[in-house]
């Protein structure tokens, strides 16, 4: 053999009970002691430190703390050094060293030692991870190393968590004993934080010890708090709230169109939008996630705003007889009432739509002019003007005529046309054509679709010529012999000699 000792590195017992520290030792065979003596020391293996003597086989002298409380259960001659300590109090917790005394100089304190832990609560062992919906085994374990007092276990607060299974007395690796009771159940999220207790009672004594453990049930997030759809006026402040219940707390993420706007590990998370714009209108998603699962919910944010200035697309130049299609569109929330006016006359209107189509089949020159597209909702009104230009062949209006005054003849040719026509005055009797470009004879003035050309002929009043007005543009030509106003009413009078 060799010098060596075997005892549990740690052992525990309840305050007020006792503990048997199992111990075996060995020594070299050649020492052959006639009698084997032994000493148990408390907290130090070094005799020079004067450690308290727990037990000494040569004498009955022990430290006052161990007076009447220590007894050797083992037979040292059989190399069994098992020690019994009774009426345990907290100050007896610590290291216990055995010293073999074989006589002569062979006194050997073994480095192997037992650490005694004096406890007053049962040990409830909960698995490191308790997940909702997955069966779990919780055990209550108490030391059973006192031969004189045996513990009885019972569970506290286990109602609804299943019936306990008592395993009874089990031997641990290092020779110590424990009483074990098991509880099998499937935890729910509601069981999180539940206080589960175990009681160790010693029959025929007043000794009773209780221990508690709070269940830390892990479960996936459920979003429990979320705005329903939100309406906000452009420029206002919006706060979206997402709250989730989970363990551990979730990572909450606010997203829009796949983009993360804000995230934090928290039970609730606000998304603050300052001075909202229509661009922020849309669907916002809150994602709650932890290691055990995820949940997501969406909220629609409606940003209310006045219509934008309408835009007009379509034909703004048309040829007489063509069909004209004009689209007026805007953006607003809610959708607007759209109206197209011409000279205060409503030509088309739609309610709660963002665009309005105006169709003019076979346009006439009367359709030419300024139009207004007006968009309106409860937040405001915007309008856009547009011009429709109808192109047509010249029309010489009937108000065109010639008139004489003193010695001058003035011919007025009023032409309605688009685009602007050329105008010429023809005097067939003289075989003369006067164009508008001849500024000394012709004065032209354009007003809208009307072109007024005036031909002035001096010294022609006595015998005014025939005058034909001809107007021409790319769509056609029209000629009209201009009537001489008041010819039938001409009065000649000669005054004087």
């Amino acid at each position: 053999g060799h010098w060596g000792a075997w005892m549990p590195s740690s052992i525990s017992a309840f305050e007020g009970t006792c503990v048997s520290i199992p111990c075996r030792f060995d020594f070299p065979d050649e020492l052959r002691p006639a009698v084997v003596h032994g000493v148990w020391y408390f907290n130090s293996p070094y005799p020079k430190n004067y450690p308290p003597v727990v037990f000494k086989s040569r004498t009955q002298v022990v430290h006052e703390s161990f007076q009447g409380r220590s007894r050797l259960l083992g037979d040292l001659g059989l190399r069994n050094c098992t020690l019994l300590l009774s009426t345990l109090s907290p100050e007896l917790g610590g290291k216990y060293y055995f010293r073999g005394d074989l006589g002569g100089y062979n006194q050997y304190t073994f480095s192997e030692h037992s650490v005694l832990d004096i406890i007053n609560t049962p040990n409830i062992v909960v698995p490191p991870e308790v997940v909702a919906g997955t069966e779990v085994e919780v055990s209550c374990m108490v030391p059973d190393n006192c031969p004189e007092l045996r513990p009885e276990l019972s569970w506290l607060g286990h109602e609804g968590l299943g019936e306990p299974t008592v395993l009874g007395r089990l031997r641990e690796d290092e020779g110590t004993w424990v009483q074990v009771s098991l509880l099998h159940f499937v935890p729910t999220r509601e069981a999180n934080g539940h206080r589960l207790g175990c009681q160790a009672a010693f029959p025929n004594t007043t000794l009773q010890f209780e221990g508690y453990a709070s269940l830390d049930v892990k479960y996936p997030p459920v979003i429990v708090e979320m705005n329903s759809s939100v309406e906000a006026i452009e420029g206002s402040h919006v706060s979206l709230l997402c709250g989730a219940d989970s363990n551990p707390p979730p990572l909450l993420t606010w997203m829009r169109d796949g983009m993360v706007l804000r995230e934090a590990v928290a039970e609730s998370l606000y998304l603050d939008l300052e001075e909202v714009t229509p661009a922020e209108d849309g669907i916002y998603a809150c994602l709650a996630e932890n290691a055990y699962g995820q949940d997501n919910r969406t909220v629609e944010l409606s940003v209310m705003y006045a219509p934008w200035k309408p835009t007009v697309n379509g034909t703004v130049v048309a040829v007489e007889g063509e069909t004209v299609s004009i689209l007026c569109s805007t953006q607003s929330n809610p959708d607007p009432i759209l109206t197209i006016f011409k000279e205060k006359q409503i030509l088309a209107t739609v309610i709660y739509e963002s665009q309005l189509q105006l169709e003019l089949p076979a346009v006439t020159p009367e359709d030419d002019g300024e139009y207004w597209c007006v968009a309106e909702n409860q937040y405001g009104q915007r309008a856009t003007a547009f011009n429709l230009s109808v192109e047509f062949a010249p029309i010489i209006l009937l108000e065109s005529h010639c008139a004489a005054a003193r010695d001058t003849v003035q011919c007025l040719c009023v032409v309605k046309s688009n685009p602007e026509p050329s105008v010429a005055f023809e005097l067939p009797s003289r075989n003369v054509t006067v164009n508008e470009t001849e500024r000394e004879f012709v004065y032209s003035e354009r007003s809208g679709l009307l072109l007024t050309s005036i031909l002035t002929l001096r010294g022609q009043a006595q015998a005014p010529p025939r005058v034909i007005c001809t107007s021409r543009n790319l769509y056609g030509t029209q000629s009209l012999e201009l009537p001489f106003q008041g010819a039938h009413r001409l009065m000649w009078a000669k005054i004087g000699p």
Partner: antibody, heavy 126, light 112 residues
Framework: QVQLVQSGSELKKPGASVKVSCKAS????????MNWVRQAPGQGLEWMGW????????TYADDFTGRFVFSLDTSVSTAYLQISSLKAEDTATYFC???????????????????WGQGTLVTVSS | DIVMTQSPDSLAVSLGERATINCKSS????????????LAWYQQKPGQPPKLLIY???TRESGVPDRFSGSGSGTDFTLTISSLHTEDVAVYYC????????FGQGTKLEIK
């Protein structure tokens, strides 16, 4: 130099007690164990036991338990052997002898007795 | 206890001659832990305390003449005085200090 000086011879009646002293000098008293050895007239040597001079812990050989007590006064570097209830067969020369011993660690390793006192003759006679 | 037996009980040797004393232990005094023999030899002259000559079976104590030597292992040991001097006349004891300490009965060495 190392010296162990023992008290003088004693003549005692049976039933009496005797206390033999052994004063050490020339070394650190508490660094060595002190042994006691008995030699009856014309006989061999008998080891009685030893005392740990640091802790004061005595160890007695099996034949020397009960009436024999080892003690110390470290302040004067002196070891004592007290024998009570003296018997005629206790008549002998008693030697003290030191031995270097590794008792600073947790385990004592024996070393031989290297220095001896001159001996004290105790005679028990009526 | 370990019993130590010396032989012879007494021995007469001429001056300058070799003297050999044997010692046998009832059990081995070789300590397995350090492979040392826990055996010593003492010399005791009349009216004096024993004087250490040899320890660990073969290690000579300082100041001891080199004519003294020790040998052996386990259970059989020998003290040898290579050349006897007048002052070597004494009783010699073997001593084991492995287990509870014991001495041999002694060997008386005289001059022939």
């Amino acid at each position: 130099q190392v010296q162990l000086v023992q008290s003088g011879s004693e003549l005692k009646k049976p039933g009496a007690s005797v206390k033999v002293s052994c004063k050490a000098s020339g070394y650190t008293f508490t660094n060595y164990g002190m042994n006691w050895v008995r030699q009856a007239p014309g006989q061999g040597l008998e080891w009685m036991g030893w005392i740990n001079t640091y802790t004061g812990e005595p160890t007695y050989a099996d034949d020397f338990t009960g009436r024999f007590v080892f003690s110390l006064d470290t302040s004067v570097s002196t070891a004592y052997l007290q024998i009570s209830s003296l018997k005629a067969e206790d008549t002998a020369t008693y030697f003290c002898a030191r031995n270097p011993i590794n008792y600073y660690g947790i385990n004592y390793e024996g070393y031989v007795m290297d220095y001896w006192g001159q001996g004290t003759l105790v005679t028990v006679s009526s | 206890d370990i019993v130590m037996t010396q032989s012879p009980d007494s021995l007469a040797v001429s001056l300058g001659e070799r003297a050999t004393i044997n010692c046998k232990s009832s059990h081995s005094v070789l300590y397995s832990s350090n492979q040392k023999n826990y055996l010593a030899w003492y010399q005791q002259k009349p009216g004096q305390p024993p004087k250490l000559l040899i320890y660990w079976a073969s290690t000579r104590e300082s100041g001891v003449p080199d004519r003294f030597s020790g040998s052996g292992s386990g259970t059989d040991f020998t003290l040898t005085i290579s050349s006897l001097h007048t002052e070597d006349v004494a009783v010699y004891y073997c001593h084991q200090y492995l287990s509870s300490l014991t001495f041999g009965q002694g060997t008386k060495l005289e001059i022939k």
